[in-house]
Amino acid sequence: AVNGTSQFTCFYNSRANISCVWSQDGALQDTSCQVHAWPDRRRWNQTCELLPVSQASWACNLILGAPDSQKLTTVDIVTLRVLCREGVRWRVMAIQDFKPFENLRLMAPISLQVVHVETHRCNISWEISQASHYFERHLEFEARTLSPGHTWEEAPLLTLKQKQEWICLETLTPDTQYEFQVRVKPLQGEFTTWSPWSQPLAFRTKPAALGKDT
């Protein structure tokens, strides 16, 4: 038998993926475990094998269909179980009634690009990936810019309280290398959390023109 504290956390990406992490103190690394999804109003069940990500935690993705297919709605409830093999039997280690649209975490924004760059300004755009049409415009974004000599953790957060897939960064230093990241969150859902940060976009401001009156 496995003793210790257990934590089972899952998020829905709003389309066709439920990502789960199961943590269990004192669990055996080589035990075979599965996450089993049993929707209350769908004709499919889905499993994924939990793979170790650290000494006491495992993760897997329940892939419900093609990436942009809308597999669940706001009224769905999915019973999620962690089952681990004990000899010839399978033991339920954790269970939850999962409401997908109360537990959202979208994919990181993609396709970041510099639209226009000047000496002190840079206009950047991005796209959201695999986000449900149900949200319409009910999304918000956070962005951050990495300046030379600083860390991402020190970068101030810029909040966009609407579905705005671009930003104009101001008061930048000429001829300087920067990096930029953005993340997204739906307004819906009691346990909804921010997406991962996007891949960083590197850009350089233009040098100041020489011999010009300011």
């Epitope: 075979s32 599965q34 089993h36 499919w44 069940n45 889905q46 499993t47 994924c48 094998e49 793979l51 897997c60 892939i63 419900l64 269909g65 093609a66 990436p67 089952l83 399978w90």
Partner: nanobody, 123 residues
């Protein structure tokens, strides 16, 4: 709808080897737990081997343990069955099966199936 197509069967002498392949199309391959079954003439279709969605865990019927190896290549949407030290009693039609539910795949009812490939082992 998911489609499965087996290949690699044939006639082989006892003690020989064959490698079966099953290509999956029509859906996201990594959703599926994959299995091999076989059906000898006049017998029920029987479970041979299973591989989980990640490929990490495999299981076998006792009669093939140590001789058969199931594996998958998620980049190629393909599952394999490497059969070594074949015996006449391995003669059967071998079927590839797919199910999104690991816990249902051994019961034949809800699986997606290929057409099968004939394996004949002569003594």
């Amino acid at each position: 709808q998911v489609q499965l197509q087996e290949s690699g069967g044939g006639l082989v002498q006892a003690g020989g080897s064959l490698r079966l392949s099953c290509v999956v199309s029509g859906d996201v391959f990594v959703r599926y737990t994959m299995a091999w079954f076989r059906q000898a003439p006049g017998k029920e279709r029987e479970f041979v081997a299973v591989v989980t969605d990640s490929g990490r865990t495999t299981e076998y019927v006792d009669s093939v343990k140590g001789r058969f190896t199931v594996s998958r290549d998620n980049a190629k949407n393909t599952v394999y069955l490497q059969m070594n030290n074949l015996k006449p009693e391995d003669t059967a039609v071998y079927y590839c099966a797919a199910n999104t539910d690991y816990f249902q795949i051994r019961s034949v009812d809800n699986n997606a199936w290929g057409q099968g490939t004939q394996v004949t082992v002569s003594s």
